[in-house]
Amino acid sequence: ARNGDRCPLGPGRCCRLHTVHASLEDLGWADWVLSPREVQVTMCIGACPSQFREANMHAQIKMNLHRLKPDTVPAPCCVPASYNPMVLIQKTDTGVSLQTYDDLLAKDCHCV
Amino acid sequence: ARNGDRCPLGPGRCCRLHTVHASLEDLGWADWVLSPREVQVTMCIGACPSQFREANMHAQIKMNLHRLKPDTVPAPCCVPASYNPMVLIQKTDTGVSLQTYDDLLAKDCHCV
């Protein structure tokens, strides 16, 4: 693994893709989504230590300034680098429609 | 302002653009950048309460699951929605070069 992918905090502690099983009720969708009834939500969770999966120059700057001024500048944050699309069967005024969302499930993660 | 831009925690507490004055030394750039000697670094700082500047559907899901399972799912995070380019005058083996970085300064912010 590249240096940027090796977690210094121990396995599974750094920014990574994580799956959470959620119902329509959990997601607050029960009133407008018919299907799926449950979703395997993939999201980005974990710490962003120095040089770990830094997304860009901005992330490097932020980490350097966080080390200097931790009370002012937060550490970089683990967020999606890209998404997987997902289709939802939605209730409409007249029935149902199928809508594909491109920004619903995280595909991979980085630190920004 | 849209509901998504009104901070329920009070002025300046929610996700917003923030400027930090930094020297080349602060940034760890002194050995490879000649100019500028100081940078007004714009970055995204602040809390992401429910419905505040949600970037996409993923952010909505994350907030709903955070409220349900705060120990497992973190709240959305304040990150750049876009960047302003910046030119750096860099030292090279033979002299200097001008390099434009597109991902260095945050332009505006949202919650993901």
């Epitope: 299907s35 699309p85 289709v87 199928l98 594909t100 619903l104 499930l105 | -």
Partner: antibody
Framework: QVTLKESGPGILQPSQTLSLTCSFS??????????VDWIRQSSGKGLEWLAH???????RYNPSLKSRLTISKDTSSNQVFLKITSVDTADTATYYC??????????WGQGTSFTVSS | DIVMTQAQKFMSTSVGDRVSVTCKAR??????VAWYQQKPGQSPKALIY???YRYSGVPDRFTGSGSGTDFTLTISNVQSEDLAEYFC?????????FGGGTKLEIK
């Protein structure tokens, strides 16, 4: 615009293997929730669901035919395939593929006619 | 397998009338029922999802109802283009099964 089109050999002899192709456009099998089903229709048995395949390669078969069916996909070329081994006259039918979104089959192809003849 | 029974193979109606096509499941399938329309020489077209929800583009004269074991597709103000065979289908459990179909004839 969602379209699906089935293709196959038209006619085979008993005991041969039927290979069907469903070529589709207007959606992607990389999208969570998307799948493709195969259904056949004959005058004797009406509409009969055969199999489906999901975006994540989850496959389901009709138990009455499971030992003879194989469904597969080529995501990059937007195609789904169905193989039926050891065909006999009872397999004479029109074969349809349909788009599946979770549990909804909302678009069907035009169908391809297949006959088993000795 | 869950048997879906459409007792009436044929129904005759006139333009402007209201007609109800029924479908009975041998066991409880909740609302996991779809309805399809198949015009002569064409492939099936999806009309109704989850027993009562019309797909977008389906005229509002088509209405689905029912839950458990008894389901109905009602066509109000029948039009000549509604001449077709109508099938119910359960997707509550594998294998998915279809009703035998009801052919609607226009007088």
């Amino acid at each position: 615009q969602v379209t699906l089109k089935e293709s196959g050999p038209g006619i085979l002899q008993p005991s041969q293997t039927l290979s069907l192709t469903c070529s589709f456009s207007g959606f992607s099998l990389t999208t969570s929730g998307m799948g493709v089903d195969w259904i056949r229709q004959s005058s004797g048995k009406g509409l009969e669901w055969l199999a489906h395949i999901y975006w994540d390669d989850d496959k389901r078969y009709n138990p009455s035919l499971k030992s003879r069916l194989t469904i597969s996909k080529d995501t990059s070329s937007n195609q789904v395939f169905l193989k039926i081994t050891s065909v006999d006259t009872a397999d004479t039918a029109t074969y349809y593929c349909a788009r599946r979104a979770w549990d909804a089959m909302d678009y069907w192809g035009q169908g391809t006619s297949f006959t088993v003849s000795s | 397998d869950i048997v879906m029974t459409q007792a009436q193979k044929f129904m005759s109606t006139s333009v402007g009338d209201r007609v109800s096509v029924t479908c009975k499941a041998r066991q409880n399938v909740g609302t996991n029922v779809a309805w399809y329309q198949q015009k002569p020489g064409q492939s099936p077209k999806a009309l109704i999802y989850s027993a009562s929800y019309r797909y977008s583009g389906v005229p509002d004269r088509f209405t689905g109802s029912g839950s458990g074991t008894d389901f109905t597709l009602t066509i109000s103000n029948v039009q000549s283009e509604d001449l077709a065979e109508y099938f119910c289908q359960q997707y509550n459990s594998y294998p998915y099964t279809f009703g035998g179909g009801t052919k609607l004839e226009i007088k």
